[in-house]
Every structure is written in C-alpha cells, then in structure tokens.
C-alpha cells in the first residue's frame, strides 16, 4: 500500500449533528445502526425512523427506511438496526413475482374446486379440484393438501384454464 495523506475540509456534513452519536470503527467496520465517516475514523449513528443499517459495514450512509404503502399495515417500525416491516391488509396478499403491490384475494374457488388454504398476507386462497386434488394452477398438491378421491377414480391432473 502506498502511504496516504488525508486532508479534511470542514464542511457541515462532516461535523456530527447532535442526534448522530459517534464511536470508533472496529477493523474498519461500523456496527449495525451506524455508517462510517468519510475518513473512516468514526462510526455515525443512523437516524431513528429515517434510516438504518442491519450489518457491520463501511458504507458512507445508512439505508432509507421503507414507508408502508396504502393497502399495507406496519407490523413493526423502522429502527436504526432494522427496516420497517410492512404487511398486506386483511383480504389482500403479495405475490413473490409481483412484490411491489398487494392484490385482492379471490373470494371463492371456481366451480368444481374446493378451498384448502385461506387468504394470507403472502398468498391467495388455495383451491384444489374436488375429484383429483389437483391445485388450480395445475400443480400436483403437496401430500397434506391432497384431497382423497373416491375409490376407483384415478387421481389425474385436470386441465382448467384461468
């Protein structure tokens, strides 16, 4: 490593604001709830309710707290070490492939299908075919979801569109 010279401008952003307590980094890293100063000499606390950091880090800034959207409820507020936890309101859910918004759960299953799973904040109601126990999506259900078919009726996937 080349020897380094450091020169500090006294800009307001570099001075510790009253609410931003400082401590020294450990092996170049600051603990959760802090970020590092530009010169790497200080750990500056995140601002409660505004930003946070969850891990030991050498980042110049804390991460901005998530604001729950309308249609979401706040399960736990943002702290200096943990982001806000938001959850879809009752009757709505968030899909993995479209996590940006809460969607309304279906009110019932299509004809010929039976409900085996309720609406939760992370999943729609789950429907299986009355006869075969096949999920509405066409997937073969897990063992605990299987609907017992009557004797002599082979369990085969049914093709349902929609």
């Amino acid at each position: 490593e080349s020897a380094l010279i450091t020169q500090q401008d006294l800009a307001p952003q570099q001075r510790a604001a009253p609410q931003q307590k400082r401590s020294s980094p450990s092996e170049g890293l600051c603990p959760p709830g802090h970020h590092i100063s530009e010169d790497g000499r200080d750990c500056i606390s995140c601002k409660y309710g505004q930003d946070y950091s969850t891990h030991w880090n050498d980042l110049l800034f804390c991460l901005r707290c998530t604001r729950c959207d309308s249609g979401e409820v706040e399960l736990s507020p943002c702290t200096t070490t943990r982001n806000t936890v938001c959850q879809c309101e009752e009757g709505t859910f968030r899909e993995e492939d479209s996590p940006e918004m809460c969607r309304k759960c279906r009110t019932g299953c299509p004809r010929g299908m039976v409900k085996v799973g309720d609406c939760t904040p992370w999943s729609d109601i789950e429907c299986v075919h009355k006869e075969s126990g096949t999920k509405h999506s066409g997937e073969v259900p897990a063992v605990e979801e299987t609907v017992t078919s009557s004797p002599g009726t082979p369990a085969s996937p049914c093709s349902l569109s929609g």
Epitope: S2, Q7, I36, D39, G40, L59
Partner: nanobody, 123 residues
C-alpha cells in the same frame, strides 16, 4: 445506471502538466467517493487520489503528494485531477472510479469504473 467518462489524457514532456476530467452520471447516492487510479503496463492498478462528495475529505498517494490536486464540481458532477511536475513513472492509463465506502483506497472497494484515459510522459 452509473456512467463515468474520463478525458484529458495525452502525451506530455517531463515537468509538464495535464488536467484530467471525469464526467459522472446516474449517481443517486446520498454520499460517495470519487477516485483516480492508474495502471502502468505490466503493473497492478494503484490508487492515486480520492475526494468525498459530501464532506470533501481528500486522500493522496504519497507518490503524487504535492504534484497532483484532486477537485470536484458538484454542479457539473465532474471530478478533476490537476497533474503537474509530471515524471516518466506517471505514465499509465488513469481511471475514474466511484465508491460508497469510507476511507476507500483499495480497488476492491470500488463498484463503478470508467474506461480510462492514457497519460504518457516522455522527452
């Protein structure tokens, strides 16, 4: 998308001067450091100088101290390196880089790099 575009390189005689520029776009971080690194043929990329956008903290490698000056224009989002008293050993490709880490003088702490501009010092 972060983009860095260096300019100002060229050929100069020993003792001469050059001013490098690095125009940055797509930077939306609350604070970041911008640096100059250089790489001579057959050698590893080495740190030259850094400046932090928010507080203005500045770093120089010992080898360029007193000869090179780093500066920034916040309004233009542009980084500069004024190089004077140039020597043959300053010959290299000069790269502009951006980090969101503190006290960053190692290449691995940088996530964004420009394409580089050639500086050649010869009689």
């Amino acid at each position: 998308e972060v983009q860095l575009l260096e300019s100002g390189g060229g050929e100069v005689q020993p003792g001469g001067s050059l001013r490098l520029s690095c125009a940055a776009s797509g930077l939306t971080f609350p604070n970041y450091g911008m640096s100059w690194f250089r790489q001579a043929p057959g050698k590893e990329r080495e740190f030259v100088s850094a400046i932090y956008w928010s507080g203005g903290t500045v770093y120089y490698a010992e080898s360029v101290k007193g000869r090179f000056t780093i500066s920034r224009d916040n309004a233009k989002n542009t980084l500069y390196l004024q190089m004077s008293s140039l020597r043959a050993e300053d010959t290299a490709v000069y790269y502009c880089a951006v980090t969101i880490r503190g006290a960053a003088t190692q290449t691995w702490k940088y996530d964004y790099w420009g394409q580089g501009t050639q500086v050649t010092v010869k009689p």
